[in-house]
Amino acid sequence: KFSKQSWGLENEALIVRCPRQGKPSYTVDWYYSQTNKSIPTQERNRVFASGQLLKFLPAAVADSGIYTCIVRSPTFNRTGYANVTIYKKQSDCNVPDYLMYSTVSGSEKNSKIYCPTIDLYNWTAPLEWFKNCQALQGSRYRAHKSFLVIDNVMTEDAGDYTCKFIHNENGANYSVTATRSFTVKDEQGFSLFPVIGAPAQNEIKEVEIGKNANLTCSACFGKGTQFLAAVLWQLNGTKITDFGEPRIQQEEGQNQSFSNGLACLDMVLRIADVKEEDLLLQYDCLALNLHGLRRHTVRLSRKNPIDHHS
């Protein structure tokens, strides 16, 4: 459960954080799992532990393996595992999948590519950026802090981006590279009058008294990023927060989904321990944006338990 994959290239720096967190004051011990041998804390060692961090300066293929970190809190020793793999440097330009960090998407309006794991290192600007092994040049590319900004993004900008920086440890410099894919979203967006997909207008939802019930209000508002769009529930025309029934709560945070390229939102209304009086309420699913407001009304009805005859 508390396990994390980390990878790096031989002769580069690799810094791994313990998957278990803890206060800065907590002691963290590191072990090489296969031998249960303690990792030293002295910085003169090539591989050493520094609190929550395990440092390979530089890494070697033979360092691959599982490392155990134990965070010693006042009450418990909390254990985490770092699964470290060090790969040989590739002679050709291709970056294999196993060295890739998570893919990021960009669009004309938002084209930031963050350099993965950089926050673990002691580095100084500027970062060097490469696309498909070529150094990025030209005014469209701006290395800013720990990310790359691409102006006027085009579909041709999709590809594998590598950031390269220098980690400094006690005056010694070590190279680090990290690669991730960048995809470009077509953002010919538009906005339209809200369309409520669920619930249906005047829907009757069957519920069981004493059980929990969920109602989902789901609506779409157009394509691409929407400037203003919201879905919410009302009870008898009153906002949930103002209604004052703690059993009935809206799910915090609206889920944004892109169904068939459409920008949609949903809000779940959770009713705990359904009571008779809940059947008397009017439940309104509201969807609104700059075009206007659409409302679908739901009522609850009692689900009759099925009679079991022998």
């Epitope: 459960k1 206060k23 004051s25 809190s73 909390r78």
Partner: antibody
Framework: QVQLVQSGAEVKKPGASVKVSCKAS????????MYWVRQAPGQGLEWMGA????????AFNQKFKGRVTMTADKSTSTAYMELSSLRSEDTAVYYC??????????????WGQGTMVTVSS | DIQMTQSPSSLSASVGDRVTITCSAS?????MHWYQQKPGKAPKLLIY???KLASGVPSRFSGSGSGTDFTFTISSLQPEDIATYYC?????????FGQGTKLEIK
Amino acid sequence: QVQLVQSGAEVKKPGASVKVSCKASGYTFTDSEMYWVRQAPGQGLEWMGAIDPETGDTAFNQKFKGRVTMTADKSTSTAYMELSSLRSEDTAVYYCTRAFDNDNDEGFAYWGQGTMVTVSS
Amino acid sequence: DIQMTQSPSSLSASVGDRVTITCSASSSVNYMHWYQQKPGKAPKLLIYDTSKLASGVPSRFSGSGSGTDFTFTISSLQPEDIATYYCQQWSSNPLTFGQGTKLEIK
């Protein structure tokens, strides 16, 4: 939302044992340690101990060591605290509680409703 | 064990007053947590890690301090703040609480 629901009030005789349960919901039970705190009538709060439901590891206030047993049933997401050799000064409300962020010990953010245990002959 | 000493043990203040409670630890602690408890209810976390406001807690509550001396403040006392307040350290086993400060309205 996180909920901790405790068992009902108990009346026990001196020398007996009591087992209080705490059923957790709204989160992954094994992701958070469960702590036990008690409060005697009109008195302050006193930490008794804790259990890590994932491993079964326990941590105790030395004052209760040997008298208290903490267990956890992963299948029902329920933690138990058993206190033996009861005496009148064990009369208290017993709470189960957990931190908001387990690894960072950011205070007891979630509490059960409390279980009143009365020790009387 | 780290002993936590709260002062005052009780205090009476008027609505709108600034109220301060102190907590002194018998040896240095890294962080302090503060709780509010109303009669017949479980305690409620107000401040964690000395100065961080717990979720949903009004901003009139605040905390500060370091080492052995910590302070809890209500900037403008409200009628609903009538309760007993406890400090708690999580720096060493056993975890310990202050004896409580009972707050009343004048």
